[in-house]
């Protein structure tokens, strides 16, 4: 039994890191393998992650971690019974994929303005709380070409757009994702989408 693709890990910079790897053949990850991990820290202890299958030869492990700080470094040991298959390390702050924003809501009762709000996925004491920026994707269910992205580069988790920038009388969906420039993160997954019917009063045209 050998590792074909070494484990690669990403952290949510909060409490979970996800490691994926591939074996050289079909493997029952949960019965044959164990991933041991330990924070390099005087008061830490070793933990064991039981991997799950991720395709025939693929394995994935969800590591429960202490609240992350930038200096953290974890040792990783992949075992098959008594055989050490791979040894490595992982710095969560160097491989961050933020959590997805939640609670996306479209407020349509603000005088021909659409107000989209969502929740920051981190608690205020987390470093990423004040460093997230967002991308909001709005698209029409009727017209695949009517697809737009709004970049929200300020900290407030909200976006205002004029209802008239979208077509009236049809349904739209929106979703939002996050990233943090400070740690050069990847984008988060998209939030669940939310749907609304766009309608607004056409301005009265005088002739």
């Amino acid at each position: 039994m050998k590792v074909l693709q070494e484990p690669t890990c990403v952290s949510d910079y909060m409490s979970i890191s996800t490691c994926e790897w591939k074996m050289n053949g079909p493997t029952n990850c949960s019965t044959e393998l164990r991933l041991l991990y330990q924070l390099v820290f005087l008061l830490s202890e070793a933990h064991t992650c039981i991997p799950e299958n991720n395709g025939g030869a693929g394995c994935v492990c969800h590591l429960l971690m202490d609240d992350v700080v930038s200096a953290d470094n974890y040792t990783l040991d992949l075992w098959a019974g008594q055989q050490l298959l791979w040894k490595g390390s992982f710095k969560p702050s160097e491989h961050v994929k933020p959590r997805a924003p939640g609670n996306l809501t479209v407020h349509t009762n603000v005088s021909d303005t659409l107000l989209l709000t969502w929740s920051n996925p981190y608690p205020p004491d987390n470093y990423l709380y004040n460093h997230l920026t967002y991308a909001v994707n709005i698209w029409s269910e009727n017209d695949p070409a009517d697809f737009r992205i709004y970049n929200v580069t300020y900290l407030e988790p909200s976006l205002r757009i004029a209802a008239s920038t979208l077509k009236s009388g049809i349904s739209y969906r929106a979703r939002v994702r996050a990233w943090a420039q400070c740690y050069n993160t990847t984008w988060s997954e998209w939030s669940p989408s939310t749907k609304w019917h766009n309608s607004y009063r056409e301005p009265f045209e005088q002739h």
Epitope: S15, V40, F41, L42, D66, D67, S70, A71, D72, D125
Partner: antibody
Amino acid sequence: EVQLVESGGGLVQPGGSLRLSCAASGFTFSRNAMFWVRQAPGKGLEWVSGIGTGGATSYADSVKGRFTISRDNAKNSLYLQMNSLRAEDMAVYYCARGRYYFPWWGQGTLVTVSS
Amino acid sequence: EIVLTQSPGTLSLSPGERATLSCRASQSVSSSYLAWYQQKPGQAPRLLIFGASSRAPGIPDRFSGSGSGTDFTLTISRLEPEDFAVYYCQQYDHSAGWTFGQGTKVEIK
């Protein structure tokens, strides 16, 4: 908002015992290492003890064998049992949250050791 | 045990001046584990700098940290009235644990 509130300080005679408590709120207590740091009157800061998320502990040489740190994750509480107290243990005792350094501190509780 | 020695013991300066505080370690310290704190009378310490040079959230940019190995510096570019306080450096070591310097008092001249 992160809050750490110490209690249990007071006047104790040399050789006596005291138990300090720290009530934590505003964060996931179980995922954080916790510490006690003290400051004698007019002196500098001294790290006393720390406890990891899994219960691993460490102590300054000056308190080893006399002090015991513990935590109750269900109650979001940190404790310091201090036995065989000496005059040099008189200090403000701070509860702190952190790891390699301490971003969050309580306001401290004063322990006076005097006969 | 790693010993941190801060100098000077007291720094007498006027508002608007630049303050340079030194922290010297008895053996090499990882920059990732070097921090600076500010403490005012009757208050708990406040983290200013971590990782030798990263400002903690909410700390004004007049505070900066630098250094590596055994020599570290905290600089306050222009002293404000609220900056007069005692400053401590602190290090963490995987075997020796946590130690603080003895402090530098920045007082009004």
